[in-house]
């Protein structure tokens, strides 16, 4: 007998062909011999089965000897062996209906787990294989679990259910609620204005929640809240802001914070957390601030950086248009009795300049 796989909620067409291409008597019955539909004269008649309101046939194809049965809005319990009786012969078609659904909301926070559950008819032994938008393959039986969702898992998941060498494909849209970046670093000279941006990796029609930027300054013994805010339909309103530093926040998305000036005492790292309405858990983005200061005091020219820098970063002091340079993989460099001229302080990573500050050394007579 022929096996046909269907998807819960979908429409399936079970075909039945007569040898002669002409209109003739036919009946569709279920395994209990209960009539579902058939032809009487030129009219489609329906039997007392549970399917009667969802079953139909293509009348236009009857005179071609095609007596298919169409079942709409498939249910798992529609899984059965259906018998088409035409021209004194019986054709059996086994219909297996499967459903694949996410156990929770399909909008999930980064780090949360996704469970896909397969609904299948009794006696079936299907296998499921899912492919994430990022190309990750996951296999399972009745359930498929993704323990920790990542940003790249956002998008359409394609899942293939296999049974008796037949397959049916499901597409499930998953939205991973996360910031675009897990971490970002801003490099600034002392006194410069600092802009922090926290773009989201998703879009929602209504975005409501609340958040906080929690800051650990390198020089401070403990961390503290720099700003708290509410988000109502993508409109940002500040709840509380610390007096030092006095941050400013943009009223629209993406979340945007401005620090009037970069100072060594602000250098450090922060964590912006955002809680969304009707979601347990929070979105996080780490942000780092590195501040540079170049100073001349008496006979000493010093360049310092504060904040989270990796040990492989190089700090250099170099006299413009001259070869005189001092470099260190450290957070401070200095030159005693520097030559007069324009000195450059550079913070670089493998030759790429991340931050520079110029200081003019005037000749001492």
């Amino acid at each position: 007998k022929k096996v046909v796989l269907g998807k819960k909620g979908d429409t399936v067409e079970l075909t039945c062909n007569a040898s002669q291409k002409k209109n003739t008597q036919f009946h569709w019955k279920n395994s209990n011999q209960i009539k579902i539909l058939g032809i009487q004269g030129l009219f489609l008649t329906k039997g007392p089965s549970k399917l009667s309101d969802r079953a139909d046939s293509r009348k236009s194809l009857w005179d071609q000897g095609c007596f298919s049965m169409i079942i709409k809005n498939l249910k798992i319990e529609d899984s059965d062996t259906y018998i088409c009786e035409v021209e004194n012969k019986k054709e059996e078609v086994e219909l297996l209906v499967f459903g694949l659904t996410a156990n929770s909301d399909t909008h999930l926070l980064e780090g949360q787990s996704l469970t896909l559950t397969l609904e299948s008819p009794p006696g079936s032994s299907p296998s499921v294989k899912c492919r994430s938008p990022g190309g990750k393959n996951i296999q399972g039986g009745r359930t498929i679990s993704v323990p920790q969702l990542e940003r790249q898992d956002s998008g359409t998941w394609t899942c293939t259910v296999s049974q008796d060498q037949k397959t049916v494909e499901f597409k499930i849209d998953i939205v991973v609620l996360a910031f675009q970046k897990a971490s970002s670093t801003v490099y600034k000279k002392e006194g410069e204005q600092v802009e922090f941006s926290f773009p989201l990796a998703f879009t929602l029609e209504k975005l409501t929640g609340s958040g906080e930027l929690w800051w650990q300054a390198e020089r401070a013994s403990s961390s503290k809240s720099w700003i708290t805010f509410d988000l109502k339909n993508k409109e940002v309103s500040v709840k509380r802001v610390t007096q030092d530093p006095k941050l400013q926040m943009g009223k629209k998305l993406p979340l945007h914070l401005t620090l009037p000036q970069a100072l060594p005492q602000y250098a450090g790292s922060g964590n912006l957390t955002l809680a969304l309405e009707a979601k347990t858990g929070k979105l996080h983005q780490e942000v780092n601030l590195v501040v540079m200061r170049a100073t001349q005091f008496q006979e000493n020219l010093t360049c310092e950086v504060w904040g989270p820098t990796s040990p492989k970063l190089t700090l250099s002091l170099k006299l413009e248009n001259k070869g005189a340079t001092v470099s260190k993989q450290a957070k401070a460099v200095w030159v005693l009795n520097p030559e007069a001229g324009m000195w450059q302080c550079l913070l670089s990573d493998s030759g790429q300049v991340l931050l520079e500050s110029n200081i003019k050394v005037v000749p001492t007579w």
């Epitope: 809240s225 809680a275 347990t280």
Partner: antibody
Framework: EVQLVESGGGLVQPGGSLRLSCAAS????????MSWVRQAPGKGLEWVAN????????YYVDSVKGRLTISRDNAKNSLYLQMNSLRAEDTAVYFC????????????WGQGALVTVSS | DIQMTQSPSSVSASVGDRVSITCRAS??????LAWYQQKPGKAPKILIY???SLQSGVPSRFSGSGSGTDFTLTISSLQPEDFATYYC?????????FGQGTKVEIK
């Protein structure tokens, strides 16, 4: 180590006055909002008032407005609660607490000072 | 003012039990909710902030969930030191308000 120590509690007659103090140590006092929370004998917690870092923003629960005043002296690392026109229903243990936790939570609390208003 | 209603007002449980306490706000407070534990004669101690984040140093058997108006504090496996009174508190708008408390007693 963060420490908050209340003092100034005691027995006072209805209509009388009392001033509670809270001495803070182990953190930069001038960088934090501070709160007073009270608890009547055998009852739950009731937030009373709070004050911002420099002392020019203050909020109160309706039942104490005009009678209780919160203030601070950052030079002395001290928080105060001036209590006037006291009533029997003001009888409670008064806790000072730091609003230094994430999401505006009260992360450190003093051991409390008992204020009894009775004739 | 925002009213915070806790339920139940008391619960009798045994060591190892799973205990859940709910807190309902009279209006939406987003995630501006904290949970505190208080033992007799002691000051309250913070357990959960921002509705669902565990305070550093608090055992992982404590968890918080919810947002908007309905919140839950769950103790997954009650320990002898967890017998205390628990309070929720909103920090969405002044005046800050606490729930009336839930006493967790030994059965």
């Amino acid at each position: 180590e963060v420490q908050l120590v209340e003092s100034g509690g005691g027995l006072v007659q209805p209509g009388g006055s009392l001033r509670l103090s809270c001495a803070a140590s182990g953190f930069t006092f001038s960088s934090y909002w501070m709160s007073w929370v009270r608890q009547a004998p055998g009852k739950g917690l009731e937030w009373v008032a709070n004050i911002n870092e420099d002392g020019n923003e203050k909020y109160y629960v309706d039942s104490v407005k005009g009678r209780l005043t919160i203030s601070r002296d950052n030079a002395k690392n001290s928080l105060y609660l001036q209590m006037n026109s006291l009533r029997a229903e003001d009888t409670a243990v008064y806790f000072c607490a730091r609003e230094g936790g994430q999401w505006l939570s009260l992360d450190y609390w003093g051991q409390g000072a008992l204020v009894t208003v009775s004739s | 003012d925002i009213q915070m209603t806790q339920s139940p007002s008391s619960v009798s449980a045994s060591v190892g039990d799973r205990v859940s306490i709910t807190c309902r706000a009279s209006q939406g407070i987003s995630s501006w909710l904290a949970w505190y534990q208080q033992k007799p004669g002691k000051a309250p101690k913070i357990l959960i902030y921002g509705a669902s984040s565990l305070q550093s140093g608090v055992p992982s058997r404590f968890s918080g969930s919810g947002s908007g108006t309905d919140f839950t504090l769950t103790i997954s496996s009650l320990q002898p030191e967890d017998f205390a009174t628990y309070y929720c508190q909103q920090a969405n708008s002044f005046p800050w308000t606490f729930g009336q408390g839930t006493k967790v007693e030994i059965k």
